[in-house]
């Protein structure tokens, strides 16, 4: 039975040209996290495999940095980066858990950044 839950940064906003950390945390399960996939709509941004390390999709390689931890740093933001992002946790033996983050990239310099999410 899948007992885990994914905590995410939820809805966040950031300034055009700035950067943002996308982060999720899986709790309430003893399942082993084998891999985390980061996706935007139907596009893969990155994969963090516990053993193999990181894969960064070529179309994002200049704007995506691995980490911190299992998270992802998105840099040089544009308004086109606005949208839904998904963290897909592959775990054993539970299976797959998915978290959702909505990012809004604002033109204004008064964009309110969501509080940095810390993994306990």
């Amino acid at each position: 039975m899948m007992t885990g839950t994914i905590e995410t940064t939820g809805n966040i906003s950031a300034e055009k040209g700035g950067s943002i950390i996308l982060q999720c945390h899986l709790s309430s399960t003893t399942a082993q996290v084998t891999q985390v996939n980061w996706e935007q709509q139907d596009q893969l941004l990155a994969i963090c495999n516990a053993d193999l390390g990181w894969h960064i999709s070529p179309s994002f390689k200049d704007r995506v940095a691995p980490g911190p931890g299992l998270g992802l740093t998105l840099q040089s933001l544009t308004v086109n980066d606005t949208g839904e992002y998904f963290c897909i946790y592959h775990t054993y033996p539970d299976g797959t858990y998915t978290g959702r983050i909505f990012l809004e990239v604002l033109e204004s310099s008064v964009a309110e950044h969501g509080a940095r999410f810390q993994i306990p």
Partner: antibody
Framework: EVQLVQSGAEVKKPGSSVKVSCKAS????????IHWVRQAPGQGLEWIGG????????IYNQIFRGRATLTVDKSTSTAYMELSSLRSEDTAVYFC????????????WGQGTTVTVSS | DIQMTQSPSSLSASVGDRVTITCKAS??????VVWYQQKPGKAPKLLIY???YRFTGVPSRFSGSGSGTDFTLTISSLQPEDFATYYC?????????FGGGTKVEIK
């Protein structure tokens, strides 16, 4: 020039073990994962697993777990794949491959090592 | 495990022909697909990754496309050196899995 040079062909009895080596050169060994893939005669490709020399992370295809052991010797930039409890179905060409940096694509391959399991 | 199904399993074509090979994943793999070329008695060679980027030295007649579950490798004008077997592979989740291969033969 990146090169992966594998050990020579082996003939083994059922129930025995084989250890194939793969010597890497032309790049920084610890910066790239080494994968192992096999190909039975006339068949397709099958992923065995990978070894990350950067932090000694090892991952196996479940169907080989318990029978395959992936190791490396960083001092000689050599990767090893040992397969135990051999059976006739393990007769195949075994390839070592290198994963590109920050990319899960196998960009350079060894020449292959033929392992024949026969009584 | 994710199954990768290639079609056709073999095809006959002439030099100059446009050739299309398809690969269908049994579940969503986003764009985590790679294509390899293998000639008899040789190791596979990386052609295309992610799934539309050509590896270093791969001629521009090779192109890849697709996302989700359906992927395509296209050779725009088949050359004599392109007669080989082509494999797709997914790395969206482990175990990494390959398609059964498509053998491109001379007509």
């Amino acid at each position: 020039e990146v090169q992966l040079v594998q050990s020579g062909a082996e003939v083994k009895k059922p129930g025995s073990s084989v250890k194939v080596s793969c010597k890497a050169s032309g790049y920084t060994f610890t910066e790239h994962v080494i994968h192992w893939v096999r190909q039975a005669p006339g068949q397709g490709l099958e992923w065995i697993g990978g070894f990350n020399p950067n932090h000694d992370g090892t991952i196996y295809n479940q169907i080989f777990r318990g029978r395959a052991t992936l190791t490396v010797d960083k001092s000689t930039s050599t990767a090893y794949m040992e397969l135990s409890s051999l059976r006739s179905e393990d007769t195949a060409v075994y390839f070592c491959t290198r994963a590109a940096k920050l990319l899960f694509a196998m960009d350079y391959w060894g020449q292959g090592t033929t392992v024949t399991v026969s009584s | 495990d994710i199954q990768m199904t290639q079609s056709p399993s073999s095809l006959s074509a002439s030099v100059g022909d446009r050739v299309t090979i398809t690969c269908k994943a049994s579940q969503h793999v986003s764009n985590a697909v790679v294509w390899y070329q293998q000639k008899p008695g040789k190791a596979p060679k990386l052609l295309i990754y992610s799934p539309s980027y050509r590896f270093t030295g791969v001629p521009s007649r090779f192109s890849g496309s697709g996302s989700g579950t359906d992927f395509t490798l296209t050779i725009s004008s088949l050359q004599p050196e392109d007669f080989a077997t082509y494999y797709c592979q997914q790395h969206y989740s482990t175990p990494w899995t390959f398609g059964g291969g498509t053998k491109v033969e001379i007509k």
